[in-house]
């Protein structure tokens, strides 16, 4: 005498479960459960989501919604897209900036903090790859700087300072005594 | 051995209130809807309320407003507070358990019923 | 609210006989492909007993002589043959949707 047998729904369409009393079809996306069916293979009373909560998928037993998340400041999130009754807010960072997640298995969910991104153009570099999910990846020193030590020097204009190796490979010019 | 016992029936003046409850015995209570059933003096069948596994009441509109179902599944007991009662509410409340292979609401086992009067 | 007549009120029936009993429902218990008619038999002093459900599904231990037909608004209970512990009133309930109703009773007496 368990009771644990759950009788299968035998109703048209596969969108339906036993709440309260009787095989009820579920709620819609962005909507929530009000009141169960009271007739078999009935339409429970669903409500929509009210402003700032959201329920993402069809669902038979949510009887509120979830609430949007808000963006943290703090890390310097913004809204990529504004929380709906069907989906949550996506935040992410704004442009220049990039996701610095704070553990080590990054998944979608995990938290973050948002970093500027490396300007190439300041550190006088080439910019090889844009920064969107990670940091800009900074390439070759521009026309009239070449390398020196971590950084960028830019071109002798005149011919009384020193021009080591590189710096007249790619200044194009030897200094001459 | 499925065993359902109503108690808390009596002499009540109209106007009054009443709790009555139902002990269960002998099965997974918590995974059953069940419901309060009255048989009036006449010998009619009237349903008077339910309570789903997963925590629904329903109430014919009648009865809304006066009659509250609440169960205790720690305890295995299944209560009906009944107020505001008048003349048409003496009848014998029996607490009734669903069948567990329906998806519908159909009554497998019985109480022996507890006897609610209503006169002044 | 679906309102259940039952017919006869009463019946006088003979030890091996058949006995016929009527529940007529007000507006349709059937949908889904399912009739949502049931059947209860009460002995006094006993409380109900579910004999069948879905109108022709037959309780678990109760005996092959009870029989249930019936579908949409008309439903039959037949006992054949009746047996001495047969006589008790019987009662249609239907679950087509909320409030739940029961028939007034059918009494069934043996000659």
């Known amino acids: 005498q368990g009771g644990t047998r759950s009788p299968r729904c035998d109703c048209a369409g596969d969108f339906h479960k036993k709440i309260g009393l009787f095989c009820c079809r579920g709620c819609p996306a962005g909507h929530y459960l009000k009141a169960p069916c009271t007739e078999p293979c009935g339409n429970s009373t669903c409500l929509v989501c009210p402003q700032d909560t959201f329920l993402a998928w069809e669902n038979h037993h949510n009887s509120e919604c979830a609430r949007c998340q808000a963006c943290d400041e703090q890390a310097s999130q913004v809204a990529l897209e504004n929380c709906s009754a069907v989906a949550d807010t996506r935040c992410g960072c704004k442009p220049g900036w990039f996701v610095e997640c704070q553990v080590s298995q990054c998944v979608s969910s995990s938290p973050f903090y948002c970093q500027p991104c490396l300007d190439c153009g300041a550190l006088h570099r080439h910019t090889r790859l844009l920064c969107s999910r990670r940091d800009t990846d900074c390439g070759t020193c521009l026309p009239g700087f070449y390398e020196h030590g971590d950084g960028c020097v830019s071109c002798p204009t005149s011919t009384l300072g020193s021009c080591p190796e590189r710096c007249a490979a790619v200044c194009g010019w030897r200094q001459m005594f | 051995e499925v065993k359902l016992v109503e108690s808390g029936g009596g002499l009540v003046k109209p106007g009054g209130s009443l709790k009555l409850s139902c002990s269960a015995s002998g099965f997974a209570f918590s995974n059953y809807d069940m419901s309060w059933v009255r048989q009036t003096p006449e010998k009619r069948l009237e349903w008077v309320a339910a309570?789903?596994?997963?925590?629904?009441?329903f109430y014919p509109d009648s009865l809304k407003g006066r009659f509250t179902i609440s169960r205790d599944n720690a305890r295995n007991t299944l209560y009906l507070q009944m107020s505001s009662l008048g003349s048409e509410d003496t009848a014998l409340y029996c607490c009734?358990?669903?069948?567990?292979?329906?998806?519908?609401?159909?009554?497998?086992?019985w109480g022996q019923g507890t006897s609610v009067t209503v006169s002044s | 609210d679906i309102v259940l007549a039952q017919s006869p009120a009463s019946l006088l029936v003979s030890l091996g006989q058949r006995a016929t009993i009527s529940c007529r429902a007000s507006?349709?218990?059937?949908?889904?492909?399912?009739?949502?008619m049931h059947w209860y038999q009460q002995k006094p002093g006993q409380p109900p007993k579910l004999l069948i459900y879905?109108?022709?599904n037959l309780e678990s231990g109760v005996p092959a002589r009870f029989s249930g037909s019936g579908s949409g608004t008309d439903f039959t209970l037949n006992i054949h043959p009746v047996e001495e512990e047969d006589a008790a009133t019987y009662y249609c309930q239907h679950s087509r949707e909320l409030p739940l109703t029961f028939g007034a009773g059918t009494m069934l007496e043996l000659k």
């Open positions: 309570f789903s596994s997963d925590g629904y009441t």
């Open positions: 009734a358990r669903h069948a567990d292979y329906a998806n519908y609401p159909v009554m497998d086992y």
């Open positions: 507006k349709s218990v059937s949908t889904s492909g399912y009739s949502y």
């Open positions: 879905l109108a022709s």
